[in-house]
């Protein structure tokens, strides 16, 4: 920690319920979202000039799930640098001491609105392709870096007014457990591809099935897979995709094996009855081509066996994606992540306390020293924008929506005030 | 081999105090977490305090918080626990316990020490 | 604090039987649960962690499993030297708590 830091640098603001103790360069603080890990706030960055999101994790360090979190969290978005990976700007801590550390504040680059939103918006054919292409092109940027996400979300992927897209977090660690028997805890599973539900093993195309039920709500305007707990989700996907093969039954642990192969058998829908062409956009012959291009897409993507399942580069070279095929971004170099142990790491808590404190006191070093980049490569909001010339830092404030945190509860936005404008 | 050697416990009046070491070999002390576990005669297992392998950080149950300090030296190969303000009700064997590299467990223990507060 | 029951606190068996002790936690601690093994006048020994992960040199008759609140320790053979008392403990968070114990002893 270096000397200099002192009160002086910092002011305390009442959010919520909480209270945000920050460096004096973000000011016009306003919530716009909470979960899991602590409360996120909108801001303008008075040294960049620009609106940012603010988030404050309270003693990341309280129990494993927060601190493996945050540990991960931390590490990942220093080494991730990808249009379409949500940016890092700046952390610090107001504590001056790692006795007296509590919490972490993340700086991360503000969007207009998350995908929840965008959900019930009309999309045309070229946003929506634009919106997937972008996913996909995340997505495997953070496979290249050996990170899986296994829960993307619509509350988890955020986008702007210009309709580019970013993803917001690193999913779950390679260590947490998924039990299909475990209790219902109260987490989004709508999107979670069935080996996740059903504790199997999994490969990079666990993602895919994810982007298959965002990209079904997309074109449905509702979640596709509602189940309310583990077995009811496994239920729904099976009355619209039919029971799976023996052969996809075999890959089962016994005890899930024994349930599965006990629930009643469904022939399944097919894609043009769960797809019709009147949910897609019609204007013109062209937009038939595309419809059934995103429904064949829908139909790879929605695979249970994730052995028949489409990959991410097969996703990525499909007709209803490539047209957006740049190299640049869906060939961007692998992050390096320097702690090779990142997804395996078991701590005392004491430890992950020590650990975290040391990210922050990295990055604090590092930016001292003219080592992070002051501007991010792909800012949120231009940089010569001011609070009130922004739509983000004022339209977003009033939406019951979150920036940079993930989320389980989907709100909605009026199809009038829309956050996708234009498009490439 | 790992070993955890304890010391210094003993009698002490109600309101005294008393300084614990745990020698530590067999294993690169500097790289593990260490914590204190204790247990009063005929009663289960009690954890006590708990440091980060640079001791940094470092946490205590509520009941001795404000009043034992948990240190170490990592030169020495040394674990400690300044006790202050003893009660009546600290009276246990104290134990000095590895947490293990693989997952947060107490994977190697010392003989433990006991501390007895008694007027 | 998150507590720990152990349930029975004493349980008396044979050479050679199934024994099984459970552990629940107050709250969900995911997989953060080992179990120890203590001798009168000994320290203890750590016999499984993660839930279900065998210590090494633990022997194979001792096995671990539970998810979340509900855990189980059982010895799938019971031999002499496995009467003892013992413990389950969280490492989910602070303070780090342990089960009030099970006694088991010789019928």
């Known amino acids: 920690m270096s000397d200099s830091k002192c009160d002086s640098q910092f002011y305390s603001v009442q959010v919520a319920d909480s209270t945000f103790t920050v460096l004096k360069r973000y000011q016009q603080l306003k919530p716009i979202g909470s979960g899991a890990q602590g409360i996120v706030c909108a801001a303008f960055d008075t040294v960049l000039g620009i609106n940012v999101a603010v988030k404050k994790l309270s003693r990341p360090f309280q129990n494993q799930t927060h601190a493996k979190r945050a540990y991960r969290e931390l590490v990942l978005l220093k080494c991730v640098n990808h249009k379409n990976i949500i940016s890092l700007l700046n952390v610090f801590t107001p504590q001056k001491t790692l006795e007296e550390f509590q919490d972490v504040y993340l700086v991360m680059e503000l969007m207009d609105a998350n995908l929840c939103q965008v959900i019930h918006m009309e999309l045309d054919h070229e946003r929506m392709s634009y919106l997937l292409y972008q996913m996909l092109c995340g997505i495997k940027h953070l496979h290249s870096a050996g990170i899986i996400h296994r829960d993307l979300k619509p509350s988890n992927i955020v986008v702007k007014s210009d309709c580019t897209l970013k993803i917001l977090d690193f999913g779950l660690a390679r260590t947490a457990c998924t039990n299909f028997m475990m209790t219902p805890y109260v987490v989004t599973r709508y999107y979670r591809a069935p080996e996740v539900i059903l504790g199997m093993g999994y490969k990079e195309n666990v993602d895919i099935w994810s982007v298959g039920c965002i990209m079904g709500e997309l074109v449905k305007g509702c979640v596709i897979f509602q189940g309310t707990d583990h077995i009811d989700q496994w239920n729904k996907v099976i009355e619209q995709l039919g029971t799976p093969s023996a052969e996809f039954m075999k890959k089962l642990q016994p005890t899930v094996r024994n349930y599965v192969e006990n629930r009643p058998k469904y022939p399944g829908i097919k894609f043009e009855e769960l797809f019709p062409d009147w949910i897609f956009p019609s204007e013109s012959e062209r937009d038939k081509i595309k419809t059934s291009q995103a429904r064949d897409l829908l139909s790879k993507m929605l695979v249970i066996d994730p052995d028949k399942r489409i990959s991410v580069d097969e996703a990525l070279r499909h007709p209803y994606i490539t047209v957006w095929y740049d190299p640049a971004e869906a060939e961007a170099p692998p992050p390096q992540i320097y702690d090779a142990q990142l997804e395996e790491r078991e701590h005392a808590i004491e430890e992950w306390k020590e650990l975290i404190y040391k990210e922050v006191m990295d990055w604090e070093e590092r930016s001292k020293n003219g080592v992070v980049k002051d501007q991010p490569s792909d800012a949120a909001v231009s940089s010569n924008a001011t609070p009130s010339q922004s739509s983000s830092i004022n339209d977003i404030s009033s939406m019951s929506t979150e920036q940079t945190l993930a989320s389980d509860t989907d709100s909605s936005l009026d199809a009038s005030t829309g956050p996708l404008e234009g498009c490439r | 081999e790992v070993q955890l050697l304890e010391s210094g416990g003993g009698l002490v009046q109600p309101g005294g105090s008393l300084r614990l070491s745990c020698a530590a070999s067999g294993f690169t002390f500097s790289s593990y977490a260490m914590s204190w576990v204790r247990q009063a005669p005929g009663k289960g297992l009690e954890w006590v305090s708990g440091?980060?392998?640079?001791?940094?950080?470092?946490s205590y149950a509520d009941s001795v918080k404000g009043r034992f300090t948990i240190s170490r030296d990592n030169s020495k190969n040394t674990l400690y626990l300044q006790m202050n303000s003893l009660r009546a009700e600290d009276t246990a064997v104290y134990y000095c316990?590895?947490?293990?590299?693989?997952?947060?467990?107490?994977?190697?223990w010392g003989q433990g020490t006991l501390v007895t507060v008694s007027s | 604090d998150i507590q720990m029951t152990q349930s029975p606190s004493s349980l008396s068996a044979s050479v050679g039987d199934r024994v099984t002790i459970t552990c629940r936690a107050s709250?969900?601690?995911?997989?953060?649960l080992n179990w120890y093994q203590q001798k009168p006048g000994k320290a203890p020994k750590l016999l499984i962690y993660a839930a279900s992960s065998l210590q090494s040199g633990v022997p194979s008759r001792f096995s671990g499993s539970g998810s979340g609140t509900d855990f189980t320790l059982t010895i799938s053979s019971l031999q002499p030297e496995d009467f003892a008392t013992y413990y389950c403990q969280q490492s989910y968070s602070t303070p780090y708590t342990f089960g009030q114990g099970t006694k088991l002893e010789i019928k």
């Open positions: 709250q969900s601690i995911s997989s953060y």
């Open positions: 440091i980060s392998s640079y001791g940094g950080s470092t």
């Open positions: 316990a590895r947490f293990g590299h693989a997952f947060p467990a107490f994977d190697y």
